[in-house]
């Protein structure tokens, strides 16, 4: 269970889903890639305190552990939780064709 | 597959509201990047874009028409409506939905006639 | 608003024969997307963005240009390449198609 969504660290600090711009040179698309030429990447950044947006009984745990041995046990990672579908114009053998990618923009952010 | 078809009144007399609708299958307005256009053509004549709308609601209108059209969509059961009011003959045309992808009318509806009389 | 003119409106050309078919926009554009119509049908895109070409078209149709000034070639004209041609931009809002160019097969 997710246990809090209330950031003890300075704001915007946290887990959270953030929107970078990127271009298709960036990403290293810029060959395959005809349309966007500009992409708004969201993403999900920043840390995972205490229980801070934990996804699942898993992510209580490495959190509770990684107090008491951080040399051991790692923090939980900010990561998806869900995701938005994308459509990328993109060239292939047989000429430009539709592609939909359904796990390239994050949607919103967990601690896992 | 993607496939979407244009349905409206037929025929329609001067200054009435032409209410138009596509109804699509084989992708989702949820998808960011996709829209839904509307073209039209009249007998022998050239294509004219009407108007755009985006996954996020955006929409964009054609400035010389822009005073008489309304769009609006309905992503759970995959339809786009556009309204064109105060027609006149000249509005007479086979009228295109299409589906959008950035920019690129990627696929096109069969078109519905539109006679006003 | 940016105005596309094609030309020529009407060409007529032989089986096997090149043809090329212009567009001149009125402001500059950073790219020309073209398509077909077939009698009675609906449009289709032919070349994405320039000169792509789209997914199942002919090797035989080509695009090239930049600027104000762009163009379709098809190096061998066939039968099932008679129609209308459009060119189409979206570099800005509103979005335009040229005025289209006939295709005719002697």
């Known amino acids: 269970a997710r246990n809090g969504d209330h950031c003890p660290l300075a704001a915007a600090a946290c887990c959270a889903a953030h929107t970078v711009r990127a271009s298709l040179e960036d990403l290293g698309w810029a060959d395959w890639v005809l349309s966007p030429r500009e992409v708004q990447v969201t993403m999900c950044i920043g840390a995972c305190p205490s229980q801070f947006r934990a996804a699942n009984m898993h992510a209580q745990i490495k959190t509770s552990l990684h107090r008491l041995k951080p040399d051991t046990v790692p923090a939980p990672c900010c990561v998806p939780a869900s995701y938005n579908p994308m459509v990328l114009i993109q060239k292939t053998d047989t000429g430009v064709s539709l592609q939909t990618y359904d796990d390239l923009l994050a949607k919103d952010c967990h601690c896992i | 597959q993607v496939t979407l078809k244009e349905s409206g009144p037929g025929i329609l007399q001067p200054s009435q509201t032409l209410s138009l609708t596509c109804s699509f299958s084989g992708f989702s307005l949820n998808t960011h990047g996709m829209g839904v256009g509307w073209i039209r053509q009249p007998s022998g004549k050239g294509l004219e874009w009407l108007a755009n709308?985006?996954?996020?609601?955006?929409?964009y209108y054609n400035s010389a028409l822009k005073s008489r059209l309304t769009l609006s969509k309905d992503t759970s059961n995959n339809q786009v409506f556009l309204k064109i009011s105060s027609v006149d003959t000249a509005d007479t045309a086979t009228y295109f939905c299409?589906?959008?992808?950035?920019?690129?009318?990627?696929?096109w509806g069969q078109g519905t006639l539109v006679t006003i009389s | 608003q940016i105005v596309l003119t094609q030309s020529p409106a009407i060409m007529s050309a032989s089986l096997g024969e090149e043809i090329t078919l212009t567009c001149s926009a009125s402001s500059s554009v950073r790219y020309m997307h073209w398509y077909q119509q077939k009698s009675g049908t609906s449009p289709k895109v032919l070349i994405y963005?320039?000169?792509n070409l789209a997914s199942g078209v002919p090797s035989r149709f080509s695009g090239s240009g930049s600027g104000t000034f762009y163009s379709l070639t098809i190096s061998s004209v066939e039968a099932e390449d008679a129609a209308d041609y459009y060119c189409?931009?979206?570099?800005?809002?509103?979005?335009?198609f040229g005025g289209g160019t006939k295709l005719e097969i002697k």
């Open positions: 189409h931009q979206w570099s800005s809002y509103p979005w335009t």
């Open positions: 709308i985006w996954w996020n609601d955006d929409k």
């Open positions: 963005s320039t000169s």
């Open positions: 299409a589906q959008v992808a950035w920019d690129w009318f990627a696929y």
